[in-house]
């Protein structure tokens, strides 16, 4: 759920790492209300996720490792 490219709330689903090609981080500021990880999926969807949740942290860590290896 996003408005002007801001996440307004978090997904209530868990995504598998195989579904995700990358992510961006949204920081709460004057433009956006909440901190979020925006996952980009193989289907071209952007999914807003809670950066505090374990499954989100795990995928971010996994993707960050991949990027660092390149």
């Amino acid at each position: 759920a996003s408005n002007f490219d801001c996440c307004l709330r978090y997904t209530d689903r868990i995504l598998h790492p195989k579904f995700i090609v990358g992510f961006t981080q949204q920081l709460a500021n004057e433009t956006c209300d909440i901190n979020a990880v925006v996952f980009h999926t193989k289907k071209g969807l952007s999914v807003c996720a809670n950066p505090k949740q374990t499954w989100v942290k795990l995928i971010v860590r996994r993707l960050s490792k991949k990027i660092n290896k390149m």
Epitope: R13, I14, L15, H16, K18, F19, K42, K52, Q53, T54, W55, L58
Partner: antibody, heavy 120, light 107 residues
Amino acid sequence: QVQLQQPGAELVKPGASVKMSCKASGYTFTNYWMHWVKQRPGQGLEWIGVIDPSDSYTTYNQKFKGKATLTVDTSSSTAYMQLSSLTSEDSAVYYCTRGNYGVDYAMDYWGQGTSVTVSS
Amino acid sequence: DIQMTQSPASLSASVGETVTITCGASENIYGALNWYQRKQGKSPQLLIYGATNLADGMSSRFSGSGSGRQYSLKISSLHPDDVATYYCQNVLITPYTFGGGTKLEIK
């Protein structure tokens, strides 16, 4: 070794609630998810929902929202599922199962299941 | 929700034969698929994870393959001990969904 202990059976009246337990041992409880799965007699498996014991984050199959409530007690390494407003459709075996995100999000250990019978 | 369709629903084969069970997803699940074996009166057991990886303690006579929307489980040199119901499961995105199951019997 990893064990998930569930009570064998629960007999409950229509309209009542039941809270079943799943005691985990042999691993660090907060490092793995706990899923709950339903199996009605002669039917397939249905995923109810999952709880992350590290932060109590839950997500449910839409079909079971309002029916099932998942909780954990990390001090006793026990997961719970409460089912409310029971009907004959809720008569089934309910399994707790460990979710392992290190093994492709698979359910790698299962409890023996709790058989719930809803009958007056 | 992603729908999982398993076939056949039941299967009878002789000891020593090779059998294949198929599982189709309603959309691409990118290999996020697991297989479980449930023997009569027992809890399900993880058999294959990530479409192709054999779970610890399971016989190497079991193998998984597939990608995209189509997956299969092959059981080589069938043993009487393989009598069970087999389920595939999508774990790409919640709600995780199971196939209807394939009941394997020995002739």
